[in-house]
């Protein structure tokens, strides 16, 4: 029996290149979230802590940016960002949430046409 | 078929100290929800400590308000062993201590429905 609720982006694509706003929200729970994480697969990509605000990891401080809200925005996206991304969310006194996206990164339209017409 | 044997209860003074460990097999998920309950005598089942992990690194224990302070949830990935380190035991810690698993991480805590729970291990804090 859970109290809360994840709600999430779900599954979303993007372009080569490109940005997208990974956004989760936690519902139906007076919990008070104490911190966030945002992982990829198996990588932490950043924390925001209530008290101690964010932290991104180093490895991904070129693409990775804070916000909006407790959200995570990821810029210049190659297609080796495809896959699930998870937002972790420790409350009091609920204990842990979890919420997963899936994000496939397309070819970018241009690249695509131009791989398909050639101009003879 | 997950399996979880605990081990390390025993009898105890009060203000004296026990490590509670709970093997686990079959459970090698990246995401793991893992928990310790407890059961004092002809009482119910009691949430004493819930521990979240995953791969990736995060690490998130909660607590009851009766253990926090005294009781640190832990865990060795090596050896996939869940441990519960008590300190400080009182009488009232006296009970039987049960570690238990979930298969879904979408929530961890002690409202949390677990599939998997060990035979449990004696604790008896007695002068």
């Known amino acids: 029996m859970m109290t809360g609720t994840i709600e999430t982006t779900g599954n979303i694509s993007a372009e080569k290149g490109g940005s997208i706003i990974l956004q989760c929200h936690l519902s139906s729970t007076t919990a008070q979230v104490t911190q966030v994480n945002w992982e990829q697969q198996d990588q932490l990509l950043a924390i925001c802590n209530a008290d101690l605000g964010w932290h991104i990891s180093p490895s991904f401080k070129d693409r990775v940016a804070p916000g909006p809200g407790l959200g995570l925005t990821l810029q210049s996206l190659t297609v080796n960002d495809t896959g699930e991304y998870f937002c972790i969310y420790h409350t009091y006194p609920d204990g842990t949430y979890t919420g997963r996206i899936f994000l496939e990164v397309l070819e970018s339209s241009v690249a695509e046409h131009g791989a398909r017409f050639q101009i003879p | 078929e997950v399996q979880l044997v605990e081990s390390g209860g025993g009898l105890v003074q009060p203000g004296g100290s026990l490590r509670l460990s709970c093997a686990a097999s079959?459970?090698?998920?990246?995401?793991?929800?893992r928990g310790w309950f407890r059961q004092a005598p002809g009482k119910g089942l009691e949430w004493v400590s819930t521990?979240?992990?995953?791969?990736?690194?995060?690490?998130?224990?909660t607590y009851a308000d009766s253990v926090r302070g005294r009781f640190t949830i832990s865990r060795d990935n090596s050896k996939n062993t869940l441990y519960l380190q008590m300190n400080s035991l009182r009488a009232e810690d006296t009970a039987v201590y049960y570690c238990?698993?979930?298969?879904?991480?979408?929530?961890?805590?002690?409202?949390?429905?677990?599939?998997?729970w060990g035979q449990g291990t004696l604790v008896t804090v007695s002068s």
């Open positions: 238990a698993a979930r298969l879904s991480t979408d929530f961890c805590g002690p409202r949390a429905d677990f599939d998997y």
């Open positions: 079959g459970y090698t998920y990246s995401r793991k929800c």
């Open positions: 521990l979240y992990t995953s791969s990736g690194g995060t690490y998130f224990d």
